[in-house]
């Protein structure tokens, strides 16, 4: 049994880190493999993660960590029974992938404006709470070429767009993702999308 693509890990900088890797052939990840992880300091406790399959040769493991802090560094050991397949280390604060924003809502009752709001995925006591910026993707359900990205570089999780910039009588969808500036993180996953109908009509004299 061989590792084809070594584990790569990302952390939500709270309590969960996710590691993914590929095996040399079809593998029942949960039955055949274990990923052991241990905080690098004195004789810290060793934890075990049971991986799940992620495609035919892919495995994924969700490592539960006790409140990740900047100093933490973990050793990772991938085992197949008594055989050590791979050994590595992982510093969560250097490989941050933020949690996805949630509760994306579209408010169309404000005349001439579409207001999108969403929730910051972090609590205020987490550093990332005040470090996130967002990208909002809006697209026409009937014409995927009619798609745009709005970068939200201010802290407030809201976006206002003039309804006139969207086609009238069309259903649109939106989704949002986040990244943290200071940590130069990867982008989060996209939030679930939300749908609305753009019923805006130009005033008669502008037609």
């Amino acid at each position: 049994m061989k590792v084809l693509q070594e584990p790569t890990c990302v952390s939500d900088y709270m309590s969960i880190s996710t590691c993914e890797w590929k095996m040399g052939g079809p593998t029942n990840c949960s039955a055949e493999l274990r990923l052991l992880y241990q905080l690098v300091f004195q004789s810290s406790e060793t934890h075990t993660c049971v991986p799940e399959n992620n495609g035919g040769v892919g495995c994924v493991c969700h490592l539960l960590m006790d409140d990740v802090v900047s100093m933490d560094n973990y050793t990772l050991d991938l085992w197949a029974g008594q055989q050590l397949l791979w050994k590595g280390s992982f510093k969560p604060s250097e490989h941050v992938k933020p949690r996805a924003p949630g509760n994306l809502t579209v408010h169309t009752n404000v005349s001439d404006t579409v207001l999108l709001t969403w929730s910051n995925p972090y609590p205020p006591d987490n550093y990332l709470y005040n470090d996130l910026t967002y990208a909002v993707n809006i697209w026409n359900e009937n014409d995927l070429a009619d798609s745009r990205i709005h970068n939200v570089t201010y802290l407030k999780p809201t976006l206002r767009i003039p309804a006139s910039t969207l086609k009238s009588g069309i259903s649109y969808r939106a989704r949002v993702r986040a990244w943290a500036q200071h940590y130069n993180t990867t982008w989060s996953e996209w939030s679930p999308s939300t749908k609305w109908y753009n019923s805006y009509r130009e005033p008669f004299e502008q037609r």
Partner: antibody, heavy 121, light 107 residues
Framework: QVQLQESGGGLVQPGGSLRLSCAAS????????LTWVRQAPGKGLEWVST????????LYADSVKDRFTISRDNAKNTLYLLMNSLKPEDTAVYYC??????????????WGQGTTVTVSS | DIQMTQSPSSLSASLGDRVTITCQAS??????LAWYQQKPGQAPKLLIY???RLQTGVPSRFSGSGSGTSFTLTISGLETEDLATYYC?????????FGQGTKVELK
């Protein structure tokens, strides 16, 4: 505002024990890692121990490992340091400290006023 | 363990002077460095975190710079209330380690 109040210091003989307490208020106690830092007379600051927010991870300086035990009671908003087998070199002012953010465990934005521990025969 | 070496261990300066204190790490700590001020009989006070971020309420005459292994705390114009001992702290890896301190006195 955040308040940290240490207590439990005093004079103790070598080999003796003490339990320090740090009563906290003004923040969500259970969300933060908390730390003890000490300062021997006329000396610099020394990290002693940290306990993570949920209490499952405790970390110690080599100089106190196996003698000191850090713990917390999230229901009582109190941090503890049980010090056994005390040595004269443990004589210091002991501070409890809270970080600015729960994932920046070393950036201590709040400190107690300190409690003095003297180990002497 | 990461060793933090501060220099100088003490310095004398006049009011209004620009004061610079350096902290050297024995290995790279990225930007995980904080600066503290301590006055006699008082608890330390956080000035700078993340290498260069000014803690709320700290006067803007204090600034921090550097990354990797070399860091600097600068006081752009020394005032009476700045006479104190300054410590750096690395929070890049366990165990947390402080510099030995720099005492700033009046010339």
């Amino acid at each position: 505002q955040v308040q940290l109040q240490e207590s439990g210091g005093g004079l103790v003989q070598p080999g003796g024990s003490l339990r320090l307490s740090c009563a906290a208020s003004g923040f969500t106690f259970s969300s933060y890692s908390l730390t003890w830092v000490r300062q021997a007379p006329g000396k610099g600051l020394e990290w002693v121990s940290t306990i993570k927010a949920r209490g499952g991870t405790t970390l110690y300086a080599d100089s106190v490992k196996d003698r000191f035990t850090i713990s917390r009671d999230n229901a009582k908003n109190t941090l503890y340091l049980l010090m056994n087998s005390l040595k004269p070199e443990d004589t210091a002012v002991y501070y409890c400290a809270k970080p600015l953010y729960n994932n920046f465990a070393g950036d201590f934005g709040s400190w107690g006023q300190g409690t003095t521990v003297t180990v002497s025969s | 363990d990461i060793q933090m070496t501060q220099s100088p261990s003490s310095l004398s300066a006049s009011l209004g002077d620009r004061v610079t204190i350096t902290c050297q790490a024995s290995q790279s700590i990225s930007s995980y460095l904080a600066w503290y001020q301590q006055k006699p009989g008082q608890a330390p006070k956080l000035l700078i975190y993340g290498g260069s971020r000014l803690q709320t309420g700290v006067p803007s005459r204090f600034s921090g710079s550097g990354s990797g292994t070399s860091f600097t705390l600068t006081i752009s114009g020394l005032e009476t209330e700045d006479l104190a001992t300054y410590y750096c702290l690395q929070d890049y890896s366990w165990p947390l380690t402080f510099g030995q301190g720099t005492k700033v006195e009046l010339k």
